[in-house]
């Protein structure tokens, strides 16, 4: 029967008595930087070309016995997970292996850097189709390794890496912390985070998604027909590399940004038990388990968006946090979040010719996060309209006044230390969808975009009594671009998007009286692109 991990990533329409999805990734080459591998194993023979690249440190210990099958174990298994005939994800993908890990599974930053440079030079000498680079390794944070990954990604290569097996914040490790890399955590057959001894999968905002990574059956280097079960984020990353190969084989022109958005979009949502993660990491960690798209074509009409969290600002009074979108993505909205509730809001601002989302800490606050909503919107022309704090008691307002521009997000930022100490404004008039409204002491920022066929609408959900969390979701066919809380509530910790749902979090209700100040309203801006829908119909 089909192994659990292949069943998990396979949409129901492909689930026959064996796993045989349409194209097997045959147009894609996957580079594997790992241990040596047994390339003539029955599961992968003819699929893996062992390059002559080898850069590994000496094995530790004078009594270390180099046993060939052990040296090949990790890499052989991963090659089998990516492209194995019977237990592989992308059965048609061809692979090239580079040896950067020794027989004990240890490598160096310099060895990995030289390996990445080898790939870059190979690509220049002999350009092939789409390339996926699988980095099933994790070491301490390295600025230089992250920079090398960024260079390769900007040359059009898709890099997939293991989040790491340290039961820790993936942002503390490289290449997991490189924003351009697709970073993968591991889940088990119950869709729970993988525990490995006293440790387990890494987590946090640097993880893009999770994938099967426990009891994964794959090629064993013990013999040419053997299989073995292995666990870890390396196995999870190998699944995503295989899925990426399948998607790129079906749509070779996909950019890294498009691929990442599709991986997120087609993932299983909200199936992971977040209680496994440390409390402060739960909101930052994506609740996503990778899956193949139900159809390898026809996804182009959707407006894809993802949520990007910044690093924590730190607690100093003037501390700020910045969240950035990838080069090919548009920042459509910006929000902020603070566990203490002490923040001075957020704003979108230009930095290096691109909009970024900046959140501001407040005096006495423990720090803030900036949350960017990053979307794929071809031919978009977006700008930020700002209204300074208003004199009138009705509060501050700003709208999209340019012809053809629609509102995709609202942000507010204030100079006073805590708006909670100020009298809230009266509620603003309803039915003005192209308008952002805020406290009179706040400056309000509207994200206004023009793109062919783009249409947006505002959706609100208000709860009169205090609630720790209020949500509002966009309906089928619409994509959440903006998420904010209505002004007038003193205890809001912040707002953020989770998939297609806008979440507004408040302080513990036990500390808040149920006055009118206790009311919480979540505001979602939901958009769709008729232009993308028409374009995809013409292609079919």
């Amino acid at each position: 029967s089909i192994p659990w991990n292949l069943e998990r990533i396979t949409p129901p329409r492909y689930r026959a008595d064996e796993y045989q999805p349409p194209d097997g990734g045959s147009l894609v080459e996957v580079y594997l930087l790992d241990t040596s591998i047994q390339s003539d194993h029955r599961e992968i023979e003819g699929r893996v070309m062992v390059t002559d690249f080898e850069n590994v440190p000496e094995e530790d210990g004078t009594r270390f016995h180099r046993q060939a099958s052990k040296c090949d174990s990790h890499g052989t298994h991963l090659a089998g997970v990516v492209s194995g005939r019977d237990a592989g994800v992308a059965k048609g993908a061809s692979m090239r292996s580079l040896r950067v890990l020794n027989c004990q599974g240890k490598g160096t930053v310099s060895g990995t850097l030289i390996g990445l440079e080898f790939i870059r030079k190979s690509q220049l000498v002999q350009p092939v189709g789409p390339l996926v680079v699988l980095l099933p390794l994790a070491g301490g944070y390295s600025r230089v390794l992250n920079a090398a990954c960024q260079r390769l990604a900007r040359a059009g290569v898709v890099l997939v890496t293991a989040a790491g097996n340290f039961r820790d914040d993936a942002c503390l490790y490289s290449p997991a912390s490189a924003p351009e890399v697709i970073t993968v955590g591991a889940t088990n057959a119950q869709d729970q985070p993988v525990t490995l001894g006293t440790l387990g999968t890494n987590f946090g905002r640097c993880v893009d998604l999770f994938a099967p990574g426990e009891d994964i059956i794959g090629a064993s280097s013990d013999c040419s027909t053997c299989f073995v079960s292995q666990s870890g984020t390396s196995q999870a990353a190998a699944h995503v590399a295989g899925i990426a190969a399948m998607m790129l084989s079906a749509e070779p022109e996909l950019t890294l940004a498009e691929l990442r958005q599709r991986l997120i979009h087609f993932s299983a949502k909200d199936v992971i038990n977040e209680a496994w993660f440390p409390e402060d990491q739960r909101v930052l960690t994506p609740n996503l388990v990778a899956a193949l798209p139900p159809s390898t074509h026809g996804a182009g009409w959707q407006l894809f968006c993802r949520t990007v969290w910044s690093a924590h600002s730190g607690p100093t009074r003037m501390a700020t946090a910045v969240a950035r979108c990838a080069p090919d993505e548009e920042l459509l909205s910006c929000s902020s979040f603070s566990r203490s509730g002490k923040r001075r809001g957020e704003r979108m601002e230009a930095q290096g010719g691109k909009l970024v989302c900046r959140a501001h800490n407040a005096f006495g606050g423990e720090g803030v996060y900036a949350i960017a909503r990053c979307c794929l919107l071809p031919q978009a022309n977006c700008s930020v309209h700002t209204a300074p704090p208003a004199e009138a008691s009705m509060g501050t307002r700003v709208h999209c006044h340019q012809q053809g521009h629609v509102l995709t997000g609202c942000s507010s930022h204030w100079e006073v230390e805590d708006l909670g100490t100020h009298k809230p404004p009266v509620l603003r008039p309803r039915g003005q969808p192209n308008q952002c409204v805020g406290h009179r002491e706040a400056s309000i920022h509207a994200s206004c975009c023009h793109a062919p066929g783009l249409e947006c609408k505002v959706k609100e959900h208000g709860i009169p009594a205090p609630q720790e969390q209020v949500t509002v979701a966009c309906e089928e066919g619409w994509t959440l671009t903006g998420c904010s809380a209505l002004p007038g509530t003193s205890h809001v910790l912040g707002a953020y998007a989770v998939d297609n749902t806008c979440v507004v979090r408040s302080r513990d209700v036990s500390t808040t009286g149920s006055t009118s100040e206790g009311a919480v309203t979540a505001v979602a801006i939901c958009c769709r692109s008729r232009h993308l829908a028409q374009a995809s119909q013409e292609l079919q």
């Epitope: 064996e18 796993y19 045989q20 047994q38 390339s39 003539d40 029955r42 023979e45 003819g46 893996v48 070309m49 062992v50 060939a68 005939r85 019977d86 059965k91 013999c223 040419s224 027909t225």
Partner: antibody
């Protein structure tokens, strides 16, 4: 061009040994092992075993255990199949083929065991 | 391992389609995606026609197709031609080795 070229025909007496060679060219040797298959006159194909060009590991069919030895010499890109204690029912055409997938075959070597 | 079961012979007229079956068990045909089909003309080495159940090597006519259901694999030849007359063998992985079918003689009438 991917090619497997086998040694010439052999006539052996019962109890003797025979060693058939198979020289591979036109591909990355370590990406595939070599399978050995035999076909007795008027009979079907029988898989005998496999040898790795990568590390010399072998995988023998149960029927052959103890009588067959498969080796390889990477320096000459050649794989070998030696069959000992020959019997008359070992008379067959012996083929080498690339890997377990057996996508490319040698031309065959006829081994006749006769007293 | 015992050989996979194939019909001893099948025949068809030029232009017709024929199907050759290959029955095994869940430990071979049913358990792996790696069923191959070989064509062998008299006095010649076998030639790979289908691999991994349904894939055709480059250079093999698209008149040849493969499929699998449960423990039985099938080779279909459409638009039968005189040069298709040959012996056909199926082959499958087992847990530790490889097993061939007994062979099917195809006669083009």
């Amino acid at each position: 061009e991917v090619q497997l070229v086998q040694s010439g025909a052999e006539v052996k007496k019962p109890g003797a040994s025979v060693k058939v060679s198979c020289k591979a060219s036109g591909y990355t040797l370590t990406s595939y092992g070599i399978s050995w298959v035999r076909q007795a006159p008027g009979q079907g194909l029988e898989w005998m075993g496999w040898v790795s060009f990568y590390n010399g590991n072998t995988n023998y069919a149960q029927k052959l255990q103890g009588r067959g030895t498969m080796t390889r010499d990477p320096s000459t890109s050649t794989a070998y199949m030696e069959l000992s204690r020959l019997r008359s029912d070992d008379t067959a055409v012996y083929y080498c083929a690339r890997g377990y997938g057996m996508d490319v075959w040698g031309q065959g070597t006829t081994v006749t065991v006769s007293s | 391992e015992s050989a996979l079961t194939q019909p001893a012979s099948v025949s068809g007229s030029p232009g017709q389609s024929i199907t050759i079956s290959c029955t095994g068990t869940s430990s071979d045909v049913g358990g792996y995606n790696s069923v191959s089909w070989y064509q062998q003309h008299p006095g010649k080495a076998p030639k790979l026609m289908i691999y991994e159940v349904s894939n055709r090597p480059s250079g093999v006519s698209n008149r040849f197709s493969g499929s699998k259901s449960g423990n039985t694999a099938s080779l279909t030849i459409s638009g039968l031609q005189a040069e298709d007359e040959a012996d056909y063998y199926c082959n499958s992985y087992t847990s530790t080795s490889m097993v061939f079918g007994g062979g099917t003689k195809l006669t083009v009438l």
